[in-house]
């Protein structure tokens, strides 16, 4: 990373250093330490104070983004004296060169696309690179397949999501021969970026008085069970006047996904389609293929 770290410290320095790969802030241990604390302040003056590691000469920041620039601070008291040191972590490089409009989505349960746009002041030879680290920080994933626009990486396709956890850190670095390129970073929850497939195995069975719709929950990247799903059924009578209201039915996920509704014979031709969402987010999938039942002369 091209970020330059500037230290603001008194004469006897703690030698504070920050490793952006592990998000670990460390300093030289002092003898007879009685108190130590570390924290960061971001550009909006929000303070993040993590727990100190056991040896008390380092701390790890779990869920932080650095692209707006932050200031780290370490306070140490020993039985003899007090130490205080600031470490500025700016996002160096020309303003407006970082990747922008960054977003990712998971689809088909095991694929992910991330896209971004070139920074407005980025030079023509800019190249961007995406790195992903999971919340356990055990592994860094480098983008395996870049999507390009005139030779510049503007997206990434991943077909192996095994390294991801429920929350992940995304970093887009940039390089250029002409000038320094700023980085962009973001924390994303997999549950918020997954787009579900529509429900599968949709069937309709009718008897003389009722019709029973059954379906299977979609396969998802997240480990979800039946109560995590909400469904919407669109039961639609065919050949009705334009502007006629469709009947939208909300159904909670269940061990056996089914919806039974009165429909007596002879019944007109109807179609039913279903979509699915996470019950807490209601980010609807696309509709399943319409299934027809009934007859034209009903």
């Amino acid at each position: 990373e091209k970020s330059d770290l500037r230290t603001v410290a008194p004469a006897s320095s703690l030698n504070v250093r920050f490793d952006s790969r592990t998000m670990n802030l460390s300093w030289d241990c002092q003898e007879n330490t009685t108190f130590s604390k570390c924290f960061l302040t971001d550009k909006k003056n929000r303070v993040v104070e993590p727990r100190l590691s056991n040896n008390e000469c380092s701390c790890t920041f779990r869920e932080i983004c650095l692209h707006e620039g932050v200031t780290f601070e370490v306070h140490v008291n020993t039985s003899q004296r007090g130490f205080q040191q600031k470490l500025l972590y700016p996002n160096s490089g020309r303003e407006g060169t970082a990747a922008q409009n960054f977003s990712c989505f998971i689809y088909n349960a095991d694929l992910m696309n991330c896209t971004w746009a070139r920074g407005p002041t980025a030079p023509r030879d800019v190249q961007y690179f995406l790195y992903i680290r999971n919340s356990k920080r055990r592994r860094e994933i480098r983008c395996p397949y870049y999507i390009q626009d005139s030779g510049t990486h503007v997206g990434c396709h991943l077909d192996n999501l095994s390294g991801l956890t429920s929350r992940n850190y995304f970093l887009v670095n940039g390089t250029s021969r002409e000038i320094g390129i700023q980085f962009f970073d973001s924390l994303l929850d997999t549950k918020k970026i997954e787009r579900f497939n529509p429900p599968s195995n949709v069937t309709v069975r009718c008897n003389t008085t009722h019709c029973l719709v059954r379906w299977k929950q979609p396969r998802t990247y997240q480990k979800l069970s039946y109560l995590d799903f909400q469904y919407q059924l669109d039961v639609h009578r065919k050949n009705t006047q334009p502007g006629t209201e469709n009947l939208l039915i909300n159904v909670s996920g269940d061990l056996e996904n089914r919806y039974n509704f009165p429909s007596s014979e002879p019944r007109a031709k109807h179609s039913v389609k279903i979509r699915a969402a996470d019950v807490r987010i209601l980010n609807w999938s696309s509709w399943s293929e319409a299934i027809e039942f009934g007859s034209d002369d009903g």
Epitope: K223, D228, L255
Partner: antibody
Framework: QVQLVQSGAEVKKPGASVKVSCKIS????????IHWVRQTPTKGFEWMGG????????VYAQRFQGRVTMTEDTSIDTAYLTLSSLRSDDTAVYYC?????????????WGKGTMVTVSS | QAVLTQPSSVSGAPGQRVTISCTGS?????????VSWYQQLPGTAPKLLIY???KRPSGVPDRFSASKSGTSASLAITGLQADDEADYYC???????????FGGGTKVTVL
């Protein structure tokens, strides 16, 4: 109709082991996750363990670690709980439950329970 | 001693509204982890009433509702009926214990 059918009541001596079964009907066990919870009049409900999707394995409550084993036979849609080195305070009703959501986790459907009595 | 604290009993006349509190800590309800509520009729297995803090599974009447704030949660039963007489338990996840935790239960009596 999905049901969890548990094995019958057991009486065991201290130091012995007990194996409780939980058969799922109306659904495939391979598509579900089972957890085990016990209930005593004094301690109330105690979670014992079950499948954790983040770890992709069965995890056990710390207090039962080393004494408890949870297994599954998906060919007959049956889950098993084995508790060894039984003590009198293991006398309880043991429930299997289907996880309806891993966020919680939420126990969407419970078996009727198996009464295990530990007495000399 | 249960990790989540509930009153041991509450009572109300038919048609009345009763509420049951469930108090946890920063490692469970306040972490924040979701809260579920279960009803246990005498001599039977527990039945899920509420999940994800305030969602009702299909088949549970809308007389049952729940909410969560900070390190506490509560269950409300409106239009109390004789067959609501049961024990009610709250449940959540606790990060320090790395597993599910339950309340000690509240006996609801319909006067």
């Amino acid at each position: 109709q999905v049901q969890l059918v548990q094995s019958g009541a057991e009486v065991k001596k201290p130091g012995a082991s007990v194996k409780v079964s939980c058969k799922i009907s109306g659904h495939s066990l391979s598509e579900l996750s089972i957890h085990w919870v016990r209930q005593t009049p004094t301690k109330g409900f105690e979670w014992m363990g079950g499948f954790d999707p983040e770890e992709n394995e069965i995890v056990y409550a710390q207090r039962f670690q080393g004494r408890v084993t949870m297994t599954e036979d998906t060919s007959i849609d049956t889950a098993y709980l084995t508790l060894s080195s039984l003590r009198s305070d293991d006398t309880a009703v043991y429930y299997c439950a289907i996880v309806g959501s891993f966020s919680g986790p939420v126990y969407g459907l419970w078996g009727k329970g198996t009464m295990v009595t530990v007495s000399s | 001693q249960a990790v989540l604290t509930q009153p041991s009993s509450v009572s109300g006349a038919p048609g009345q509204r009763v509420t049951i509190s469930c108090t946890g800590s920063g490692s469970n309800i306040g972490a924040p982890y979701d809260v579920s509520w279960y009803q246990q009729l005498p001599g039977t297995a527990p039945k899920l009433l509420i999940y994800h803090n305030n969602k009702r599974p299909s088949g549970v009447p809308d007389r049952f509702s729940a909410s969560k704030s900070g390190t506490s949660a509560s269950l409300a039963i409106t239009g109390l009926q004789a067959d609501d007489e049961a024990d009610y338990y709250c449940q959540s996840y606790d990060s320090s214990l790395s597993g599910s935790v339950f309340g000690g239960g509240t006996k609801v009596t319909v006067l």
